[in-house]
Structures are given as C-alpha cells and as structure tokens.
C-alpha cells in the first residue's frame, strides 16, 4: 500500500494552525456556468478569471460573463467586469496572454450578428486597464503574439484573411487573403498556407506555403503542393504531395524555407498522417501513421539536420488525425519520454525511453505494488501509465502525467501494475529519478500539483461527492498530511497553481450548491508557513542522473555527458523559493558507438552497435536516394546523435562512400533516375 498518515512519517508540526491562517476563501457573486483562469506574467501574482453563463433561448443565446482580477496569487479577487463594459466575452478564444512578462492581455468579445467586425479588449498593464477596439474583421482564431515582439499580433478572419497588427491590436491590416493556417516563426517571420481555387479543404495538397519577414510588405512562396506545415525547434516541416500519386512526403528546412530537403521517412496516403511529437533545436520525434485505421504508427527520431531518421518505436498508439497519443516529454529529466504502444493482442502498454528515443523499455514495477489481474506472471509485470488516451476514453483518470523542469527527477502519474493498462480504478505513482523507479504514492485517483520546485506536492482525491480535504507532502510523496480547508464541502472542479511550479500557493476551485442557486468558490492556500525557513546548502544532496550501474565507468552518460544535480533532501522542510535555480554540473563522457546513429544507407543489425551498409535500398530509402539532395548521399555511415557532447573514446570515422550509384531501381523510369530535385 502507499505510505500515509498511519506510518511513521515526517510530520510537519502545528500545520493545521499554520495553514488555517493562510487559507483564503473567495465566493464569486455568480451563477455557475463555466470558469477559465489565466496567469498574467511570471511571479506577478496576477490572475484573471472569466466566468460565463449561457442560457439557450428559442431564438438566440443569452450570455453573461464576468471578469475578476487577483494580484495576490488568488487570495482576493476584484470584479473588473466594468473595465470591459460588461461585455460578453467569447470563451472559445480564451484569454490571450502575452509572452514573458509583457503584461499584455487580449479578450475577444461576442458581437451581434450584423456587425461589421469583431471587438477586442486590450490591456498592456497586467489587466489593470482595458481599451476597447472594434476590429475590421470577425476573428476565427485567438490573437497570436509574436514570440519576439508582443506588440505584433496576427489573427485569421472568418473569411480566411490573414490580419496583422503592429501596435498591439490598435490598428489592423489584412496582409493576405485565402489563408488556411498561419504561424509565427523566429525573428517576427510569419509562415502561412494559401489556397488558389476553392477553399482550404478543397485545395488540401495543392496549397502554397508563403513567408513574410516584414509583416506583410513582401512575400516569398517557399513551397507548393502543400498539404500542411509545422514548426518544431529550428526545423520547418511541410508535407508535400507527390507528383505521381495521392501520397505525400515530409520535406524539411532549417533556413526558414529557402532550401528544402526530403526527409528519409515513409510517404503517407490520404487517410494517414504525420505528427511532430516533440522537437527541439537538436532533433525531432516524428510519428508516421500506419496505413488503414489501425490506431498506431511508428515513431522516428531525426538526425541533427532533420533529414535522416531512425526507427525508434513500432506500434505507437496514436488514434486518427488530431486524435490521442500518450506521448509525454518528462521535463524533469533530460532525454526521458513516456508513451503507449498497442500490442498485438490490442492491449495498451506503457514504454519509456531514457536516451531520447534510442531504446524503449517497460516501466519497472513499483517495489510496493502487486501485479494486477492483467499479469500472466504475478511476480513479473510493469507499471503502465494513464495519459491522454485513457482520459479520452473516460477512464477514472483526472490528470495526465506531471513533471516540472525545476523539480528534478520527479514524475507523478496515474497508473496500474500488470501486463497492460487496466480499466480498473488507477492509483497515483511517483518517480524521483525521472522514471527509472516508481513508488505507489496515493491510493485511488487524485488531482496533484507540484509547488516550490518540488518542496511540496499537493493532492486532492477525485470524487463525485463534495470535498473539503487537501493532502500535502514535503518529502516527495513519501508521507502525507491532510488538511480540512473548509467546514462546508464543495463540488471540486480543479486545482490551480502558477505555471512553473515555483509558487507556494494553491487554489482549489469548485462550486457550492444549495436548493436555489450554485456559486463558484475558490480557496487559496499559502504553504509559506509550512516551509518556515529558506533552504541552505546542508538541505541539498548530490544526485547523479541516469545512474544505473555505479561499477560502469560511464554510469549516467546520456547523449555524451552526465549531469549531477543538487537536490533537496527528502527530510528537509524548507523553501527552495521563487528564485531557485537548479544547480547542475555536467561532465563529458568518452564516445562509444552508442553516441552515433547510422547515416542514410546504413543500419544496425540486431544486438550490434556497428553500422552496416544496407545491401540494397528499398521503399522510402530508395525514394530518398533518388530525390534527396546530392550532398546527403555521401557518408561514412555514422552521424553523431543530435545534441551528443561526447569527446575522445571511439571515433567510427571510415572511408566516405557515395551512395548515388545505389540509386537505381527497375520500378522507376529511367528519366526519374537522372533527375534531382533540390
């Protein structure tokens, strides 16, 4: 069973009194409808809450929304609906919060049917004041801020116009018509697809990809026959229709679309899809859907150019386009990702990689857990994690896995222990080493959040009944204490804490229901008095990430370097604080063949770390060979894994081979064999 109050646990003294003095209730003078909450800026304490109430009448919908503002992390709220002239705000657009600490907020209003354009309310002082602006168009999407300059906004209109503002929404200009999708790139560049004939849907696969680097003064067409495009890290991807059939292929650019290379990935048909699962400046995880309605595909990982791909994981669960995948980046430890596979017997199993997709394994069985009914062997089974797919299937899973970059090594997730994911009620598990080992943390489903960079974990039981108890742990989930935050239980709807897990405040949201009315209510609890003192040097201990065998000279080496972290001791009850910075020390490892991937035209035989030349090129390899750029076909067989920092040791450099002469096939016409496309 999970550790709890009944065991000999690390007690926090007098916590009830300390928390009672720091529990703040706010009842919203509001009929219950929907509520949305946004944090404005980082460490500002400013929260905006929008409540909306819809009454569908026979002819029209009557709606009312209210806007509230807090500047003390949710302890007190002020009704500021009058600042937006009591206007009904469209919740589907949410609150568009500006990047970084710009203090900018855009709210999109509901306008009557006959109006010429939409209406927005803009604030650039953390929602202290708003300016009403009438738009020359009806917005189709939320306003998008340029990551580089929060004064630059773009939006699509309901008539597929691309509109840009250079003065934070004061004045708008339509820079292009017939636009399907638009995204900000780096350096205030805008990428967008356009249709020539009918519509976005009708022209799918015949779209053009355009770029503007000067907010619409000039344009460059950087792609044709486009199906869709995406940005990930420093890579720009486009799926491009093939000349000869209805298949499409991924093309990659690392220079904003000036030059393109074909990616060495399988082509996909009409019913299939590509999906960028994760990307950074080093590499990309790409999912390629299987033909047919299988619900799975293959994960490929890229080289540093985004061109050559290694097969990473087969039978990767990903239901139809835009559907559900459990792919999760464990942000608390470099190189770790968790996802689900659909096994031959149609059961779903969790897999984890610790080396950025190089190898995948099952999750180790938690020491304090038994194998469930799904296990053939009661002594040998694995932990299986519930994520997006389970949530979409309406299993009793209130939250996806949680990790935070500044709470090193901590991963919290719902799971079951057996041979596959179970439909039974899950428990909550925690790992303190980035997913290598797991412990049952809480019995049954819970909502959970990380505060003070891991110094406190807070949880609330997932229940259909009203609740009034919160649980907290100061030792990474080993021991739990419960606190009754109100005498009158509430119907719980969510936990809210400031993004970044640096705060010590948690807000519990819910509603109270009486015979005649129901109202929104929030309870904000500040844990600052539980963690009375600031952490000192003696409160931290040194931890080597990815350690699996201390007797191995290269223990902890991932992507050519190991990292040691200073981590809070489990017994220390102190504040990391808002300014806490993770202290880590990298050390470079010697190179081994594991630090290299096989370049195009080479592969690793089973249980061998050497890259061997493929005897013949087939399928998508051959296509890449024929249509890929010439310089990509000259190789010594190895490429360093993206982001790998190893030095010395093995250097598998050997003679460079030109694979162009292998680019021949009876299945392709002679004229195709001579052509090269850049």
């Amino acid at each position: 069973s999970a550790p709890g109050e009944d065991e000999e646990c690390g007690r926090v003294r007098d916590f009830v009194a300390k928390l009672a003095n720091n529990t703040h209730q706010h009842v919203f003078d509001d009929l219950r409808g929907s509520v949305s909450l946004s944090w404005v800026g980082d460490s500002t304490g400013v929260i905006l809450v929008l409540t909306t109430f819809h009454v569908p009448l026979v002819i029209m919908t009557f709606g009312q929304s209210k806007l509230y503002r807090s500047e003390d992390y949710g302890k007190n709220f002020k009704d500021i609906t009058d600042l937006i002239n009591n206007t009904f705000i469209r919740t589907e657009f949410g609150m568009a919060i500006g990047p970084e600490n710009s203090g900018k907020v855009v709210l999109t209003a509901e306008v009557s049917g006959g109006s010429r354009g939409g209406r927005i309310f803009r604030s650039s002082d953390f929602a202290k004041n708003f300016v009403q602006t009438d738009l020359p168009f009806h917005p189709l999407t939320q306003m998008m801020y340029s990551p580089q300059n929060s004064d630059y906004l773009l939006a699509l209109s309901t008539e597929n116009g691309l509109w840009v503002s250079k003065n934070f929404g004061g004045k708008w200009e339509e820079i292009h018509k017939a636009v399907c999708l638009a995204k900000w790139g780096s350096d205030n560049t805008i990428f967008f697809t356009t249709y020539a004939n009918g519509s976005c849907k009708a022209d799918l696969g015949a779209l053009e990809l355009w770029r503007t680097s000067d907010l619409g003064k000039s344009f460059k067409t950087i792609g044709v026959k486009i199906y869709s495009f995406g940005l990930g890290g420093r890579f720009l991807f486009a799926s491009v229709m093939a000349d000869k059939d209805t298949t499409r292929r991924i093309h990659v650019s690392t220079d904003q679309g000036d030059t393109w290379s074909m990616a060495q990935l399988p082509s996909v048909g009409q019913e299939q899809f590509y999906s960028i699962l994760a990307a950074n400046d080093d590499m990309v995880f790409m999912h390629v859907d299987e033909p047919g309605d299988t619900g799975f595909g293959t994960i490929f990982t890229s080289d540093d150019r985004g061109i050559v791909y290694s097969k990473s994981l087969d039978r990767h669960l990903y239901t139809t386009t835009g559907g559900e995948t459990d792919f999760t980046n464990v942000t608390s430890l470099r190189g770790v990702y968790i996802t689900s596979v659909l096994s031959e017997d149609n059961s779903i199993q969790t897999m984890i990689t610790f080396d950025q997709g190089g190898r995948w394994t099952h999750l180790r069985k938690p020491e304090n857990s038994e194998c469930d009914a799904t296990a053939k062997n009661k002594n040998e089974c694995s932990l299986h994690i519930h994520a997006s797919y389970s949530i979409s299937q309406k299993l009793n899973v209130p939250m996806a896995p949680l990790s935070e970059p500044n709470a090193v090594g901590i991963v919290i997730a719902h799971g079951s222990v057996g041979d596959a994911i179970s439909v039974m009620v899950p428990d909550v598990y925690i790992s303190d080493d980035g997913g290598y080992s797991w412990t049952k943390m809480l019995e049954g489903p819970h909502y959970y959040t990380i505060l003070d960079s891991g110094g406190i974990i807070v949880a609330i039981e997932h229940s259909s009944r009203p609740i009034n108890v919160i649980k907290f742990s100061t030792d990474e989930g080993q021991c739990w204490q419960t606190y009754t935050f109100t005498r009158d239980p509430i119907y719980f709807t969510g936990l809210a804490s400031e993004p970044g897990a640096r705060s010590m405040n948690i807000s519990i949201w819910g509603f109270t229901e009486s015979f005649l009315t129901s109202q929104w209510v929030s309870y904000t609890i500040d844990f600052k008095d539980i963690l009375e003192r600031n952490c000192e040097e003696k409160d931290y201990t040194i931890w080597l990430a990815h350690s699996t065998d201390p007797e191995d000279y290269e223990d902890g080496c991932i992507a050519g370097y190991k990292e040691q972290f200073l981590r809070l001791r489990k017994s220390s009850v102190c504040q990391n604080g808002r300014d806490y910075v993770v202290t880590k020390q990298p050390s470079i490892c010697l190179c081994s063949l594991e630090d290299f991937l096989c370049d195009f035209g080479y592969y690793r035989p089973e249980n061998d770390s050497k890259c061997v030349e493929q005897p013949e090129l087939k399928g998508h390899d051959l296509e890449f060979c024929l249509y890929g750029r010439e310089e990509h076909l000259t190789t010594n067989g190895y490429r360093k894994i993206p982001g790998d920092k190893c030095q010395g040791g093995v250097n598998p450099v050997r003679e460079v081979k030109d694979l162009k002469k292998k680019c021949t096939s009876n299945f392709l016409s002679p004229e195709k064999q001579n052509s090269k496309s850049n």
Epitope: D475, S547, P550, E551, R569, K570, S587
Partner: antibody, heavy 124, light 106 residues
Framework: QVQLVQSGAEVKKPGSSVKVSCKAS????????ISWVRQAPGQGLEWMGG????????NYAQKFQGRVTITADESTSTAYMELSSLRSEDTAVYYC?????????????????WGQGTTVTVSS | DIQMTQSPSTLSASVGDRVTITCRAS??????LAWYQQKPGKAPKLLIY???SLESGVPSRFSGSGSGTEFTLTISSLQPDDFATYYC????????FGGGTKVEIK
C-alpha cells in the same frame, strides 16, 4: 575487489596541518563518493565530510567547516583529507570509506568499503 | 544537524540470545539509515543499508527495521563473532552516527 589504502601514521604539532591520502584500486573510483570518518581513542565515529570525484563536489560537517579540505585526483584514484589548525583533540584514527551506491544518490546507502585507518597524533 | 540517539550504550548477552539495538533520529530520515559493526583496532563493517537491506556477505541473523525516526537492529541468535560495538548512521542529512552500543559477553 575494491580496496582503499591509506597513508601511514602521522605525528603533528598543535597548530600545524596534516594531509592523509586514500588510494582506491580495483573499482570505478570516480563513480562513488568518498567519506572521511574519524574516531578518537575510546570514542565513537564522527563524519568529517565527503567528496565526489566527478566534478570534485565536497561537503563538510559543520563542526569541521573551514578547517578541513577534501580533494580527489581522478587520474590516480586518490582522495585526500587535509585538516589544519590541529589541536590535541584531533588525535584520532582517520578512516576513508567509499559510500555504497544503488541509485543516483551518493550518500544514502552506507559506507561499504573502508580504508585501514591512519593514526594522527597531535602532541607538542 | 540530525542527532542520532542509540540505546542501550552497553548490552550484556549470551551466545544464542536475540539482541535488539534501537536508534532514534531527531527528525524523520525516511529509510536512510545504515548499521555498522566494529571490532577493536579494526575499521567498521557495513551490515545494513536503507534501514532493512542486508549488505552482501552479511549473515542473515542480522536484520534491520523501521522508518521515519525509530529504527532497530536485531541479531536473531548471537554468535561468538558478534561481540563488538554497533553504530547506526543516518544519511538524509549531513551524515551523523549514533553513539554506539557495545555488545559484551554476559
């Protein structure tokens, strides 16, 4: 099998310093923390501090802070403990010990390999 | 720093006896506790780590239990070779040792 071999006995005058070495053989020295523990005649064990050879991260018991320096030389698989401003109460057997390790935590699993001990006598 | 209080300081027992030594931490240390045996003129020897895990090569008559603040070392049947001094040591703060328990022949 891992072994820790310490330098020989020392006789020192009050106010001076002593530097004791601890050489590891037969294991991966760099991947384990080395702790220094002392034992005064007829007394119990007292932890002075420790070091992780990779990166040279040292930490010290509050009592010895400022008076002890622990270093490690990866190339020779040797750890050193230097104690300054010696007084007669520092007369003790000084042990180096390897911190066992089952996970990424360096100090949590007890000291599984010990040196033979170095007797330091402080006398005027 | 975390204080470790060991009791008793001296224990008289006979061969075959079941012996229990207790160690109390001044604050919770989870399971991060080790037990050592030391004989005169020799370096200490690790018996138990993580409160209850037996170090390899240590006879199974030695066992450890406890978590949080209360821990015990038990020798199920005392052997002639077991007369020595035993120390507990916590590892979840700057390392500290208990004062020791001398197990002597009754």
């Amino acid at each position: 099998q891992v072994q820790l071999v310490q330098s020989g006995a020392e006789v020192k005058k009050p106010g001076s310093s002593v530097k004791v070495s601890c050489k590891a053989s037969g294991g991966t020295f760099r991947n384990y923390a080395i702790s220094w523990v002392r034992q005064a005649p007829g007394q119990g064990l007292e932890w002075m501090g420790g070091i992780i050879p990779i990166g040279g991260w040292a930490n010290y018991a509050q009592k010895f802070q400022g008076r002890v320096t622990i270093t490690a030389d990866e190339s020779t698989s040797t750890a050193y403990m230097e104690l300054s401003s010696l007084r007669s109460e520092d007369t003790a057997v000084y042990y180096c010990a390897r911190q066992g390790r089952k996970t990424g935590y360096y100090y949590y699993y007890g000291m599984d390999v010990w040196g033979q001990g170095t007797t330091v006598t402080v006398s005027s | 720093d975390i204080q470790m209080t060991q009791s008793p300081s001296t224990l008289s027992a006979s061969v075959g006896d079941r012996v229990t030594i207790t160690c109390r931490a001044s604050q919770s240390i989870s399971s991060w506790l080790a037990w050592y045996q030391q004989k005169p003129g020799k370096a200490p020897k690790l018996l138990i780590y993580k409160a209850s895990s037996l170090e390899s090569g240590v006879p199974s008559r030695f066992s450890g239990s406890g978590s949080g603040t209360e821990f015990t070392l038990t020798i199920s049947s005392l052997q002639p070779d077991d007369f020595a001094t035993y120390y507990c040591q916590q590892a979840d703060g700057h390392i500290t040792f208990g004062g020791g328990t001398k197990v002597e022949i009754k």
